[in-house]
């Protein structure tokens, strides 16, 4: 009778993570009598995957009834495959011996490759906000995929970016891989509503790439422009001065009025109006009683935006054209929270 051969017909098997792998093995003879074992890897460090005779292997089931007389099918199924299961699996026939069974013949091996989906890309931007015309870096990370081949693209508002660097780790063979990419983006004043998108394409995703996004509203700071104007006289001896704070983002803003360098009033932006581009406008006004002044008044609108150093705009209020009336240096009526009398 011909000597027993162990046949592993599949050189390689490709399985998606989470699925079941079938590793086929048949023997050409029932002789010699003895059990089979499955190993991952070869040599002294090989890992026992299944032993027909003894042990508990909860993820492994046999395809056929190994206890059946005349059975020569030693195929197994391994459930809930993960990338860590990748490797070469050997079906090994043992000959019954005393006290221990003796290895008789091994199959040629079946290489199990695991296809694992990449994790959802996570995009993170800079720790601190930056202003338009500055270049900021965004990073994108995705992990746990196999095989190694993967494509990553960056987009800003649907337009593909070209200034980025990508690494896939590790460089050598591994059960699974990670990708890390850094893209450089130049900010513009219109980027409050902009999005940066990292798109990852992999064989496991069947043409439906994964996307991670970052909103530039978390990254950008648009500093305000200030304009101080003197309005026509509202009433005799009263001038209305306004400070227009335009096109700023984010909303966090504090405004201080100074009269000849002295703090007159401080307020926080509340009822702002939003522009189409996502930036905000705000206006503060001050009612000045000019008859109380002998000299010209320097009014300064000072704005501290998002914790940045203050910016200011001044306006010189001419009082010489307004003759001073007797008793006008007494306290005048304060006509509103945004009004201020000057003594």
């Amino acid at each position: 009778e011909e000597e027993l051969q162990v046949i592993q017909p599949d050189k390689s098997v490709l399985v998606a993570a989470g699925e079941t792998a079938t590793l086929r093995c048949t023997a050409t003879s029932l002789i010699p009598v003895g059990p089979i074992q499955w190993f991952r890897g070869a040599g002294p460090g090989r890992e026992l995957i299944y032993n027909q005779k003894e042990g508990h292997f909860p993820r492994v089931t046999t395809v056929s009834d190994l206890t059946k007389r005349n059975n020569m099918d030693f195929s197994i199924r391994i459930g809930n495959i993960t990338p860590a299961d990748a490797g070469t699996y050997y079906c090994v026939k043992f000959r019954k011996g005393s006290p221990d069974d003796v290895e008789f013949k091994s199959g040629a091996g079946t290489e199990l490759s695991v296809r694992a989906k990449p994790s959802a890309p996570v995009v993170s931007g800079p720790a601190a906000r930056a202003t338009p015309q500055h270049t900021v870096s965004f990073t994108c990370e995705s992990h746990g995929f196999s095989p190694r081949d993967i494509t990553l693209k960056w987009f800003k508002n649907g337009n593909e970016l070209s200034d980025f660097q990508t690494n896939v780790d590790p460089v050598g063979e591994s059960v699974s891989y990670s990708i890390h990419s850094t893209a450089k983006v130049v900010l513009t004043r219109e980027d409050v509503h902009s999005q940066v998108i990292c798109e990852v394409a992999h064989v496991t995703l069947q043409g439906d790439p994964l996307r991670g996004t970052a909103n530039l509203s978390e990254t950008i700071r648009v500093p305000p422009t200030l304009e101080v104007t003197q309005q026509p006289v509202r009433a005799e001896n009263q001038v209305n001065v306004t400070c227009q704070v335009r096109k700023f983002y984010p909303q966090r803003l504090q405004l201080t009025w100074l009269e000849n360098g002295n703090v007159s009033r401080t307020e926080t932006a509340s009822t702002v109006t939003e522009n189409k581009d996502g930036t905000y406008n705000w206006m503060s006004w001050l009612l000045v009683n000019v008859s109380a002044h002998r000299d010209d008044v320097k009014l300064t609108c000072q704005v501290e935006h998002d914790g940045q150093p203050a910016v200011s705009k001044s306006h010189d209020l001419k009082v010489s054209a307004h003759p001073k009336e007797q008793g006008s240096n007494t306290a005048a009526e304060n006509t509103g929270s945004n009004e201020r009398n000057i003594y």
Epitope: L30, I31, T61, S64, D65, T67, K68, R69, N70
Partner: antibody, heavy 124, light 105 residues
Framework: AVTLDESGGGLQTPGGALSLVCKGS????????MNWVRQAPGKGLEWVAG????????YYGAAVQGRATISRDNGQSTVRLQLNNLRAEDTATYYC?????????????????WGHGTEVIVSS | ALTQPASVSANPGETVEITCSGG?????YGWFQQKSPGSAPLTVI????KRPSDIPSRFSGSKSDSTGTLTITRVQAEDEAVYYC??????????FGAGTTLTVL
């Protein structure tokens, strides 16, 4: 001592169904394949069905194929034979058997113990 | 079905052999004793040559090529019974022989 106790036999009507249960004791039930064997009056032994030790694999004789279901509950140490669409030729004494650490369902060379049997009569 | 002789006979103290053939390739044989119709069979040999603990050593089994043999040495009157062989065919289905009646003269 190894004991196999069958129950569920008796008078059955043609076209009906029967359910035989075998309770094993005195051995590690989950480690052994089990078989059902019957003997019609005045006839020889006939294999009916068998089941592997873990219950994953079942085997049936030609005479009952498609009408029989063998199952086991290793927690309860029982094996059950369900036989549908009964015929007069199913009349027999049904024996529960245990395999002795080798083989599986259908491997009759491995039988090392027998139950006392339960008689089934199919008659109208 | 397996093939076995319909009957054999022997005098007390003699040795008797009962043969069985027709099992699947490389299959083994078991031997079952039934002393009367309707009484439960008793395994005397399983897996070609294994003997249950309560069976006397006068009973032995062997297999050569594809034929199984039950040997009873020093036959006794109490050994009178029908002996069935059992195995599996090439499809894995269980098969019995028709039975051999042993008569002790």
């Amino acid at each position: 001592a190894v004991t196999l106790d069958e129950s569920g036999g008796g008078l059955q009507t043609p076209g009906g169904a029967l359910s035989l249960v075998c309770k094993g004791s005195g051995f590690t039930f989950s480690s052994h394949a089990m078989n059902w064997v019957r003997q019609a009056p005045g006839k020889g032994l006939e294999w009916v069905a068998g089941i592997s030790s873990d219950g994953r694999f079942t085997y049936y004789g030609a005479a009952v194929q498609g009408r029989a279901t063998i199952s086991r509950d290793n927690g309860q140490s029982t094996v059950r034979l369900q036989l549908n669409n009964l015929r007069a030729e199913d009349t027999a004494t049904y024996y529960c058997t245990k395999n002795g650490g080798c083989g599986s369902g259908g491997d009759l060379d491995c039988i090392d113990a027998w139950g006392h049997g339960t008689e089934v009569i199919v008659s109208s | 079905a397996l093939t076995q002789p319909a009957s054999v006979s022997a005098n007390p103290g003699e040795t008797v052999e009962i043969t069985c053939s027709g099992g699947g390739s490389n299959n083994a044989y078991g031997w079952f004793q039934q002393k009367s119709p309707g009484s439960a069979p008793l395994t005397v040999i399983y897996d070609n040559g294994k003997r249950p603990s309560d069976i006397p050593s006068r009973f032995s089994g062997s297999k050569s090529d594809s034929t199984g043999t039950l040997t009873i040495t020093r036959v006794q009157a109490e050994d009178e019974a029908v002996y069935y062989c059992g195995s599996a065919d090439n499809s894995g289905a269980g098969v019995f022989g028709a039975g051999t009646t042993l008569t002790v003269l």
